[in-house]
């Protein structure tokens, strides 16, 4: 079962697996949560009744009843792995840590003018894991503004320590705001010659990548096939780094491959979540348990379900056996990967899909698009909600995407006249307006959240954030679109899609069926000589044919410009407004999302 | 210290090609990357093209994918930009810069060269 809240003066005893420093305790639940085996654990404060030495401990701990037996103890806070949890989790945290000096190596020393210019530049550089920056009141006169950048095995500091006037906090690169550049190619035939950090078992190239990627250490990676000459080295991943951050050599050696950690990347691709089976090959390690199941579908089910279970082999029945019931062999290991990789022995592994949480929703693949048409298929934008508003009349009022499980993001101007969010009914997973009934479900609205520097779309801030009285559970038919990363501000969007209910010319009516429309981007310059009585500004992005005929139109407003970009659809506008519908040389205009991402954050995460 | 000097700037016609040069001295060998940024009249300071000098790798950001190579010549210390198909958009101050880290960021850059300009236009 999932437990979130933390337990005050509490010490879970025995099951330790490792003990790490972190600033806090919910950091400390979040290591856990990330660490391969660890189910619970046990924080210690800083405390006078507590010796010094043990402040800021975080033992991981691991337990096979997923429970262990509780200790009163000053100044301990435990708590539960957010493994057994179905909400999305992420390694992001944002957190300064005031008089705190977190210790590690020090690999890097400079002047900055603030702490978020230290925590910038830990960001942005390759190593670094964390920082400690000495502020201005600092008492050692040569010391002040001094940004420490810094790194460790683990990726956690080795000690932490209490400092007056210092500050320390982490890189930001798993919040995706790194400017680290990023090399997505595997590249075929190759190996790097550089340090090894570590290595473990892995069924493929792919696999071997995003361990990498969530590796502290690992900044790029050689796999070595399964027909690769040297017997005991098939299937190896070797996790690499180098004092540059690059390899320094490559060698060009048939049946390896080798790539980059995506630590930089990440925002968009799944990189904890292995979902691929793997015929005819056989997963080695501590088994778990036995139990009879159906497929190998059925199999990676019972190892998502069982919390400790990390992989699993699959021996189908033989015949007529067991009803048609083949085994299934939950499995798991200190590190998360396989000690073994066998292959020709008839079994079907694959990894459990209780990590694919830890990437977010949105990068899920959905189904793929129907190609030629206007009118859109169920679950084709699982993201695209109907807003509606129940006064005077029930009706279609805008549209709007879910970016996460108690937002919706839409436009500003389509609450002119909205007094109350009462009136207001959120319906997602719709493809046809018909479809809704006095007793089709739907989410009420608790809050409008509108730009405060919005006055009217044209004059630009046409966002508004709506929450949710409930939560969304995601299914194949709603869930949610990634927000674009401010690292892709340079992305060059080819695939872009508008979708709505709304009218498909200028005097017409909201349609029955949800429309869609490939469109074009144009660029702010191309756009502005559109409109010239207008000002587009950077935080407009605009869109549309030059001949015209395909556009978004009234009814349309507050919902997606959808583009996809390495196989993940990200929400890079919200339809705001324009001359007319589709006409020539008058292109749509849409609140440009990533210039926004900072407030969307700001707003969602907001206690 | 390392110097870096850009060449090969000027005037040319959208569809036109151009090919800069950055010749680099001192301490060079310390460095893990070097990369090509431009700055437009009144736009923030953008990446370009990225290479890892050791290994070689490249990285372009979008709108150059396709038009701009980046390449070295290690024996004369110079990296060069060849710029194929250029439009009016491209028209900005070049510089080369040289750090240790492969970044898009131009403050993970210790050295800049003085800038070449590239103007496109009919």
């Known amino acids: 079962e999932c437990v979130t809240q933390l337990l005050k003066d509490t010490c879970f005893e025995g099951g330790d697996i490792t003990t790490v420093f972190t600033p806090s305790a919910k950091y400390c639940q979040v290591v856990c949560t990330y660490h391969p085996r660890c189910l619970l654990f046990t924080f210690t404060a800083e405390s006078p009744s507590e010796d010094p030495t043990r402040w800021f401990t975080c033992v991981l701990k691991d337990s096979v009843t997923e429970t262990l037996p509780r200790v009163n103890r000053t100044a301990a806070i435990s708590g539960y792995s957010f493994k057994q949890c179905s909400h999305q989790i992420s390694a992001c945290n944002k957190d300064i840590y005031v008089d705190l000096d977190m210790k590690g190596i020090n690999y890097n020393s400079s002047v900055a003018k603030s702490a978020q210019e230290c925590q910038e530049r830990c960001t942005d550089d390759v190593h670094c894991h964390f920082f400690t920056y000495a502020t201005r009141q600092f008492p050692s006169l040569e010391h002040r503004n001094i940004c420490l950048l810094k790194h460790t095995q683990t990726g956690t500091p080795t000690r932490i320590t209490k400092l007056d006037k210092v500050v320390s906090g982490f890189s930001l690169k798993s919040c995706a705001l790194s400017n680290l550049a990023c090399i997505r190619d595997i590249f075929p035939n190759t190996v790097f010659a550089d340090s090894n950090i570590d290595s473990v078992m892995a069924p493929d190239a792919f696999v071997c990548g995003r361990i990498c990627t969530h590796h502290p250490g690992c900044l790029f990676f050689t796999f070595f096939s399964q027909e690769w000459p040297k017997e005991s080295q098939r299937n190896l991943c070797l996790l690499k780094t180098s004092e540059s951050g690059l390899p320094s050599t490559r060698i060009k050696k048939s049946k390896a491959l080798s790539g980059f950690s995506l630590q930089s990347c990440r925002h968009s691709i799944p990189v904890f979540c292995h979902s691929s089976f793997y015929h005819d090959t056989d997963f080695l390690g501590e088994e778990l348990d036995i139990v009879a199941a159906k497929s190998h579908e059925a199999c990676q089910k019972l190892c998502t379900n069982a919390v400790r279970c990390q992989f699993f082999t699959y021996t189908p029945a033989q015949a007529s056996c067991n009803e048609g019931k083949g085994k299934c062999y939950l499995k798991l290991s200190s590190n998360g990967s396989p000690t073994k990789i066998l292959h020709g022995r008839g079994g079907i592994s694959g990894y459990t899909l209780r990590l694919c949480k830890m990437d977010n929703e949105c990068t899920t693949k959905i189904k793929p698009r129907i190609v030629g048409g206007t009118a859109s298929v169920r679950g084709e934008w699982p993201w695209q909600v109907t807003l509606h508003t129940t006064s005077p009349t029930q009706r279609h009022l805008c549209g709007g995407s879910i970016i996460g499980n108690q937002w919706i993001l839409t436009a500003a101007h389509c609450f002119y006249g909205v007094e109350s969010p009462k009136i207001l009914r959120v319906y997602s997973g719709i493809l046809n307006q018909s479809e809704i009934k006095e007793d089709t479900s739907f989410f009420g609205v608790q809050e409008i959240i509108i730009h405060d520097q919005y006055k009217m779309a044209e004059s630009g801030y046409d966002i508004a954030l709506l929450k949710l009285e409930t939560t969304v559970n995601y299914t194949d038919s709603q869930r949610p679109i990634c927000l674009p990363s401010k690292g892709d501000r340079n992305v060059i969007y080819t695939d872009c899609w508008v979708t709505g209910w709304g009218y498909r010319k200028l005097r017409d009516k909201i349609q029955n069926t949800l429309q869609k429309a490939k469109i074009p981007l144009v660029t702010n310059e191309e756009c502005q000589k559109r409109y010239r009585g207008h000002k587009i500004t950077h935080k407009m992005i605009c869109a549309g044919y030059r001949e015209g005929g395909k556009d978004a139109c009234k009814g349309d407003s507050g919902g997606p410009l959808s583009c996809k970009h390495n196989e993940v659809w990200h929400l890079v506008g919200i339809t705001s407004w324009g001359e007319g519908c589709a006409q020539r040389e008058r292109p749509g205009v849409y609140t440009n999302v990533v210039e926004y991402v900072d407030w969307i954050l700001e707003k969602t995460q907001a206690v | 210290q390392v110097q870096l000097v850009e060449s090969g700037g000027g005037l040319v016609q959208p569809g036109g090609s151009l090919r800069l040069s950055c010749a680099a001295s001192g301490y060079t060998y310390s460095m893990g990357a070097m990369a090509w940024f431009r700055q437009a009249p009144g736009k923030e300071r953008e990446g370009v093209a990225l290479?890892?000098?050791?290994?070689?790798?490249?990285s372009y950001t979008d709108s150059v994918k396709g038009r701009f190579t980046i390449s070295q010549d290690n024996s004369k210390n110079t990296v060069y930009l060849q710029m194929n198909s250029l439009r009016a958009e491209d028209t900005a101050v070049y510089y080369c810069?040289?750090?240790?880290?492969?970044?898009?960021?131009?403050?993970?850059?210790?050295?800049w060269g003085q800038g070449t300009l590239v103007t496109v236009s009919s």
């Open positions: 810069a040289a750090g240790t880290q492969f970044s898009w960021s131009p403050g993970s850059y210790n050295y």
């Open positions: 290479i890892a000098t050791s290994s070689g790798f490249i």
